[in-house]
């Protein structure tokens, strides 16, 4: 039975040209995390595999940096980066947990972080 929950940075906003950290945290489970995928809609951005370490998709290598931790840093943001991002925790023996973050990239200098929220 899946007992864990994923806490994410929730809905966040950032300025065009700046950077942002996408963070998820899996809690309330003793399951072993075997891999974390970071995905944007239908694209695989990066993977952190327990055995193989970090791998960044070639098309994002210039603008995506691993970490901190199991998080992901997006750099040189453009308005096209606005959208949903997913952290997908592959765990053993529980199975798969998914967290969602919505990022809005703003032209203006006003960018505030949204509240944290949980996905069971």
């Amino acid at each position: 039975m899946m007992t864990g929950t994923i806490e994410t940075t929730g809905n966040i906003s950032a300025e065009k040209g700046g950077s942002i950290i996408l963070q998820c945290h899996l809690s309330s489970t003793t399951a072993q995390v075997t891999q974390v995928n970071w995905e944007q809609q239908d694209q695989l951005l990066a993977i952190c595999n327990a055995d193989l370490g970090w791998h960044i998709s070639p098309s994002f290598k210039d603008r995506v940096a691993p970490g901190p931790g199991l998080g992901l840093t997006l750099q040189s943001l453009t308005v096209n980066d606005t959208g949903e991002y997913f952290c997908i925790y592959h765990t053993y023996p529980d199975g798969t947990y998914t967290g969602r973050i919505f990022l809005e990239v703003l032209e203006s200098s006003v960018a505030e972080h949204g509240a944290r929220f949980q996905i069971p």
């Epitope: 075997t34 595999n49 070639p58 053993y92 199975g95």
Partner: antibody
Framework: EVQLVQSGAEVKKPGSSVKVSCKAS????????ISWVRQAPGQGLEWMGG????????DVAEKFQGRVTITADKSTSTAYIELSSLRSEDTAVYYC???????????????WGRGTLVTVSS | QSALTQPRSVSGSPGQSVTISCTGT?????????RSWYQQHPGKAPKLMIY???YRPSGVSNRFSGSKSGNTASLTISGLQAEDEADYYC??????????FGAGTKLTVL
């Protein structure tokens, strides 16, 4: 449309090798693992191994280690399996199958090729 | 000898429900969540019906459901239809380990 198209049937002599291809289309090839599963006539499914192009990681079932080579060509979105030292019991339909989830952690297989019949006979 | 044990055959009449069991007989394929079920009609490629014990891929009828208790996963088909007659395979795929298939169960619709 997401699909896997396999190469045609092969007839091989014992002791020889066979190489089967699996061309993917309709998705980002490098993001998903591809496994090879075979099925002897009237028998069940048998996982042989798989490749995750994103990591260039290859896993081969213990039974086939030393006899199976699995490769992928990202430029043509094609996966290959080569089986050497063929014997009559290798006669089977060989399927390629795509991981359900991106990243190739070893997974359920949601897209399958139609299969390639390999017959080993003297 | 597979590390997953399935009954060789099951049968049922149209409209009935049938359940196929799949028991892990080794620690590698024990009580984890990575279990799936495939349907295979004669001469066709397998089709994924259930993954991670109880999740249905899009396009699969909600007459198919999966569950697990301990080392045993089960596939239940409700409202049995003639086209459900096929072979069914369970699979175990723990991360970073070999995928294992059960020997298969032949479902006959009477």
């Amino acid at each position: 449309e997401v699909q896997l198209v396999q190469s045609g049937a092969e007839v091989k002599k014992p002791g020889s090798s066979v190489k089967v291809s699996c061309k993917a289309s309709g998705y980002t090839f490098a993001s998903y693992g591809i496994s090879w599963v075979r099925q002897a006539p009237g028998q069940g499914l048998e996982w042989m191994g798989g490749i995750t192009p994103f990591f260039n990681r290859v896993d081969v079932a213990e039974k086939f280690q030393g006899r199976v080579t699995i490769t992928a060509d990202k430029s043509t979105s094609t996966a290959y399996i080569e089986l050497s030292s063929l014997r009559s019991e290798d006669t089977a339909v060989y399927y390629c199958a795509r991981d359900l989830r991106r990243g190739g952690v070893g997974d359920a297989f949601d897209i399958w090729g139609r299969g390639t019949l390999v017959t080993v006979s003297s | 000898q597979s590390a997953l044990t399935q009954p060789r055959s099951v049968s049922g009449s149209p409209g009935q429900s049938v359940t196929i069991s799949c028991t892990g007989t080794s620690p590698d394929v024990g009580s984890h969540a990575y279990r799936s079920w495939y349907q295979q009609h004669p001469g066709k490629a397998p089709k994924l019906m259930i993954y991670e014990v109880s999740y249905r891929p899009s396009g699969v009828s909600n007459r198919f459901s999966g569950s697990k208790s301990g080392n045993t996963a089960s596939l239940t088909i409700s409202g049995l239809q003639a086209e459900d007659e096929a072979d069914y395979y369970c699979s175990s795929y723990p991360p970073s380990s070999a995928t294992v298939f059960g020997a298969g169960t032949k479902l006959t619709v009477l």
